[in-house]
């Protein structure tokens, strides 16, 4: 990924398009990698995270990580691709506008991961059941 | 259809303050980033300023660093711009407009607001 | 910052005449380049997003082109409603630059 400030010309090798044959381009996203956070028992929180880049690859999604253990909490933004696994998970909720977090089966830690594909979506990490998408007439406002 | 209305322009003294609001509607608020760009009486246009969907990362112009302040309130669809410490050199029109998704229109400004007229004069 | 440079700052045309404005970036944008048309008294438009493509709407006579630091909007046969202010912008990078504008105008 490409971030603003770094003179660099995006990568546009690989075109994307969509079903109806748009050009799809890279999205932004946050992307600070791995930081201590102090996120903890909200329903929401935001990254401070102060880097926005361009996603190097058109398909790419924005991705948050939220990690608990015994001595710390990390937050990871990042973009990637949602047809790769991250941290061994599939991203099912890539086509989503919100990052709601989604908690996730690792040994030793509490572990939650969401992305989404709207611009700089991982910026604000949603933890709330409010936002739970098993809900359809949720997932018409999430969607709309 | 998306609709975007400034409100709040009028004539202030050097050195006072004004609000300007813009009430959108006709598209998902929260998740589009929100600028204002700015146009002296018969000159080009300036951006002024962003803040994104979520309203955690705000920029600012040089010109207007430390005296502006872009927000927004996501239940109400309005975006805001605090205006302080207003100079001659800052009346302009000054316009609300949308940043369409990168994915999408790689982030061109697709929708403008109609405009308010800030004047700054004693 | 990067600086837009737009070329030429006015010009004169009629109506059908084929007119070609050109936008020069500092330094590489990719193909991050958008036009905009502006009427005395309104807000400004979108036309091209992207460097080359037509936004919604937007009459196929208008046209756009280039990668990488040099672009191009034409109008390939000008209609009396083009007649207007025309301003590029870059959306590479924050803050999103404009050209200085290039106003079209009937000879």
């Known amino acids: 990924t490409i971030p603003p400030h770094v003179q660099k010309s995006v990568n546009n090798d690989m075109i994307v398009t969509d079903n109806n044959g748009a050009v799809k381009f890279p999205q932004l996203c946050k992307f600070c990698d791995v930081r201590f956070s102090t996120c903890d028992n909200q329903k929401s929180c935001m990254s401070n995270c102060s880097i926005t880049s361009i996603c190097e690859k058109p398909q790419e999604v924005c991705v948050a990580v939220w990690r608990k253990n015994d001595e710390n909490i990390t937050l990871e933004t990042v973009c990637h691709d949602p047809k790769l696994p991250y941290h061994d998970f599939i991203l099912e909720d890539a086509a989503s506008p919100k990052c709601i977090m989604k908690e996730k089966k690792k040994p030793g830690e509490t572990f939650f991961m969401c992305s989404c594909s709207s611009d700089e979506c991982n910026d604000n990490i949603i933890f709330s059941e409010e936002y739970n998408t098993s809900n359809p007439d949720l997932l018409l406002v999430i969607f709309q | 259809e998306v609709q975007l209305v400034e409100s709040g322009g009028g004539l202030v003294q050097p050195g006072g303050s004004l609000r300007l609001s813009c009430a959108a509607s006709?598209?998902?608020?929260?998740?589009?980033?929100m600028t204002w760009v700015r146009q002296a009486p018969g000159k080009g246009l300036e951006w002024v300023s962003v803040?994104?969907?979520?309203?955690?990362?705000?920029y600012y112009a040089d010109s207007v660093k430390g005296r502006f302040t872009i927000s927004r309130d996501n239940s109400k669809n309005t975006l805001y711009l605090q205006m302080n410490s207003l100079r001659a050199e800052d009346t302009a029109v000054y316009y609300c407009?949308?940043?369409?998704?990168?994915?999408?229109?790689?982030?061109?400004?697709?929708?403008w607001g109609q405009g308010t007229l800030v004047t700054v004069s004693s | 910052d990067i600086q837009m440079t737009q070329s030429p700052s006015s010009l004169s045309a009629s109506v059908g005449d084929r007119v070609t404005i050109t936008c020069r970036a500092s330094?590489?944008?990719?193909?991050?380049l958008n036009w905009y048309q502006q009427k005395p008294g309104k807000a400004p438009k979108l036309l091209i997003y992207?460097?080359?493509s037509l936004q919604s709407g937007v009459p196929s006579r208008f046209s756009g082109s280039g990668s990488g630091t040099d672009f191009t909007l034409t109008i390939s046969s000008l209609q009396p409603e083009d007649f207007a202010t025309y301003y590029c912008?870059?959306?590479?990078?924050?803050?999103?630059?404009f050209g200085q504008g290039t106003k079209v105008e009937i000879k």
């Open positions: 803040i994104s969907g979520s309203g955690g990362t705000t």
């Open positions: 912008q870059q959306s590479y990078s924050t803050p999103p630059t």
């Open positions: 992207a460097a080359s």
């Open positions: 006709g598209f998902t608020f929260d998740i589009n980033a």
């Open positions: 330094q590489s944008i990719s193909s991050y």
């Open positions: 407009a949308r940043r369409g998704q990168y994915r999408e229109i790689a982030g061109a400004t697709d929708y």
